[in-house]
Interface confidence: low
């Protein structure tokens, strides 16, 4: 019906046409040079097929090409048509680049805008059998053929096709690198569980590995593990004890397996505790001490239980690299079971056992209190000789107002007295003895110090010039001994101490200055201490006159005269009466005076003459004396 | 008894990273350092497939299915934490993803709660 001629290179044609659709037998093809030279080929072609590559011709030849369809023996109209071959494009040269074992690179020059593509065949060279035919865009100069065999010889040819023709081809041969491989596989760190694979490769970029791992008498199923491509070791955990294995390998690379490498192994025997033993055993503790295989275990589990079942039971989760564990916190003269299990990432062994009994406390009892008093007491207390290093004494008020006081003590001491406590409130007493840096139960106790002791009633009598009498009351079979101080109130002189022996409760004092006001304090000393003391305000009495003299006495006068007190006083008051009896005289003169004239007296008389000084409504005792008047004459 | 806790899931854009966090605890006194760790996944309507797992001493095996070379896995033995680095990611790697205790496939005997990864295209 129709035929043409589409894409005329410069070495071949393809052609198309078209046909009614009758069930053809085939097609016979003629393809012979214009000008008749050559002889023409003839072609036979499936009845089904409308299109055919021509390939074969010369260059820039014109050829007249002829087709005919044969269907039931019957043969259709010849349709013709004519074309010619292109001429030869020049390519360059062509080479090849990264060869590996799988692939390479091809490279070409080319005149730029030649050829609308290229077209490149492989052919393996031992069987001339084509692998590849590709075709590739005009402007490209390079590709890379993958997918081919390893150590294998390989022709490649490329030729450029423009619109109309295709150039001569060029060629090259190549030999593909050799298969990647694995080597030095090696097993280390065999443990009883578990070990590690090593291997090496050539320098390639594996997708993965797979890793086989099968008991060596084939009991159980293998393990495949993939690992990354980029490891050359791996651990493989999670296997039996003491038991023979084969560990294979493979590596995968672009879709292709390498050979398998296998080596054979046997893991470790499972590890083992052993040889628990007791030592150091103290009241509340005791040392352990076992064995083991080393390197193994992450942890042991230490279990202690009382024989009789009556504690909690202690468990202990210690380091799997310790060989050695101290127990304490026991309590003292009990019988104990001890367990021990080590525990590794996937066993736990069997558990061993042992017996420790802990000591028995040395005694410490009878806590008693003594010698109380306002300010504290006695501790004592027994103990077993040479059984405790040293001894912990606690003080506290009942009230647990004041923090506690606390008292370390030498293991020889059984006695502890205790000064300086706040008097009549309670307190408690513990006693603890330490041994081996153990600390037993401690003793209790209680007392309460007794009332502070007291002073009281301090009172002033009997003021004299020179003194007065004081006089107290106190608690009974407590003080010592009290003590007085008295000080002038203008402080004018320095303060006097007096210290008395404690039965007394008066006391005169003397020496003081007449007619001054005196402080005065006392405190009662017990054991050492001092009371509250008690004060009171005394005032010594006003001095008397002294020296009474007379003088120049006449039958009816005389002149008294007399040296002052060493206070100032107001004033003098002079009494003089007959001794016979009379009525008395007096006459009141200043307080800076020393001597008065008395009249009117009567001649030939025997008068007593007093002389009192005064201040305020307070009176000296009086200076006395007597005189004669003269008789008339 | 041991918990796992994961962590670090969530919605990423195909072709995007995540890293996921696994922490340990209650481990009765054993130190992290004795557990080998796996991770899994699960995608709605799957099975749990494997993905990886990480030993004792830190190798490491995947499974070239589900990781493809894009997944890696490390431990943080000081911080009781194992990590599950994905990168490139795909749309099918949208799954729950867990971590387990033991490693290797061989008796996983405790498993966290699991965490998702979204993978939007």
């Known amino acids: 019906e129709n035929l043409t001629v589409t894409e005329a290179g410069w070495d071949g044609l393809r052609l198309n046409w078209t046909a009614d659709d009758l069930a053809y037998e085939y097609f016979v093809i003629q393809v012979q040079e214009a000008n008749n030279v050559e002889t023409a080929h003839n072609f036979t072609v499936p009845g089904n097929l409308r299109a055919a590559d021509i390939p074969g011709l010369k260059v820039a030849t014109s050829y007249r090409v002829s087709i005919y369809g044969v269907a039931r023996g019957y043969r259709t109209p010849v349709l013709s048509a004519e074309t010619s071959t292109g001429t030869t494009p020049n390519l360059g040269e062509v080479t090849v680049a990264e060869v590996g074992w799988d692939a390479l690179t091809l490279n070409w020059t080319a005149p730029e805008g030649a050829y609308k593509n290229f077209f490149i065949q492989v052919l393996e060279a031992d069987t001339t059998q084509t692998v590849q035919n590709l075709t590739v865009p005009g402007g490209l100069r390079s590709v890379d053929l993958p997918g081919l065999k390893a150590a294998t010889r390989y022709y490649i040819t490329l030729r450029g096709v423009t619109q109309d023709f295709g150039t001569a081809p060029l060629s090259v041969e190549v030999l593909t690198e050799d298969l990647p491989q694995l080597g030095g596989l090696s097993v280390t760190e065999v443990s009883w569980d578990g070990l590690t694979l090593n291997w090496t490769t050539d320098d390639l970029a594996y997708k993965h590995f797979v890793v086989q791992v099968q008991e060596a008498n084939n009991v159980e199923a293998a393990q495949n593990l993939t690992v990354p491509g980029s490891l050359r070791a791996v651990d493989i955990p999670g296997l039996k004890a003491d038991t023979p294995y084969r560990v294979s390998i493979y590596g995968v690379i672009q879709g292709y397996r390498t050979p398998m490498l296998s080596t054979d192994v046997s893991t470790a025997r499972e590890p083992e505790i052993g040889n628990l033993n007791v030592s150091d055993v103290t009241p509340k503790s005791f040392n352990l001490s076992w064995t083991a295989t080393d390197g193994i275990f992450d942890m042991f589990t230490i279990e202690i239980i009382d024989s009789n079942r009556l504690l909690q039971t202690a468990e202990h989760n210690i380091s799997g690299a310790e060989r050695t564990a101290h127990i304490s916190g026991l309590p003292p003269s009990t019988d104990f079971i001890v367990y021990l299990s080590g525990i590794a990432p996937s066993i736990r062994t069997k558990t061993i056992s042992t017996t420790a009994t802990t000591e028995a406390l040395p005694l410490l009892e009878n806590l008693t209190i003594s010698d109380t008093n306002p300010y504290g007491f006695t501790v004592s207390w027994t103990a077993s000789e040479n059984a405790f290093d040293s001894f912990l004494v606690t003080v506290v008020d009942s009230g647990k107002l004041l923090d506690p006081q606390e008292f370390t003590l030498s293991g020889t001491q059984r006695k502890l007295e205790l000064r300086g406590l706040i008097t009549g409130i309670g307190y408690e007493v513990l006693v603890s003895g330490f041994t081996q840096g153990h600390q037993t139960k401690p003793l209790r106790a209680e007392t309460i110090t007794e009332a502070e002791p007291e002073v009281d009633n301090l009172l002033v009598s009997d003021a004299t010039p020179d003194g007065f009498r004081l006089s107290w009351t106190a608690d009974e079979g407590i003080f010592d001994s009290f003590v007085i101080r008295i000080r002038d109130t203008k402080k004018q002189s320095e303060p006097q101490e007096i210290s008395l022996p404690s039965p007394e409760r008066t006391r005169d004092i003397t020496g003081l200055r007449e007619a001054t006001e005196y402080e005065i304090e006392l405190y009662g000393i017990s054991r050492g201490r001092r009371s509250q003391p008690v004060s009171a305000i005394a005032t010594t009495a006003m001095g008397s006159p002294k020296e009474i003299m007379f003088s120049d006495i006449t039958e009816n006068a005389a002149t008294v005269s007399w040296r002052a007190p060493t206070a100032q006083v107001e004033s003098f008051r002079i009494t003089y009466v007959p001794m016979t009896g009379g009525a008395p005289s007096m006459v009141t003169v200043d307080g800076t005076d020393t001597e008065t004239r008395l009249v009117k007296l009567t001649p030939g008389v025997e008068y007593r003459v007093s002389v009192i000084a005064m201040k305020g409504f307070e009176e000296s005792d009086p200076v006395s004396g007597t005189l004669i008047t003269a008789l008339d004459g | 008894q041991v918990q796992l806790q994961e962590s670090g899931g969530g919605l990423v854009q195909a072709g995007g990273s995540l890293r996921l966090s696994c922490v340990a605890s209650g481990t009765s006194g054993l130190t992290f350092r004795s557990f080998g760790l796996g991770w899994f996944r699960q995608a709605p309507g799957k099975e749990r497939e494997f993905v990886g797992a990480?030993?004792?001493?830190?190798?490491?095996?995947y499974n070239p299915d589900s990781s493809k070379g894009r997944f890696t896995i490390s431990r943080d033995n000081a911080k009781n934490t194992v990590y599950l680095q994905m990168n490139m990611l795909k749309a099918e790697d949208t799954a729950v993803y867990y971590c387990a205790v033991n490693g290797l496939g061989l008796n996983y005997d405790y498993w966290g709660q699991g965490t998702q990864v979204t993978v939007s295209s």
């Open positions: 990480i030993s004792m001493t830190g190798g490491t095996i």
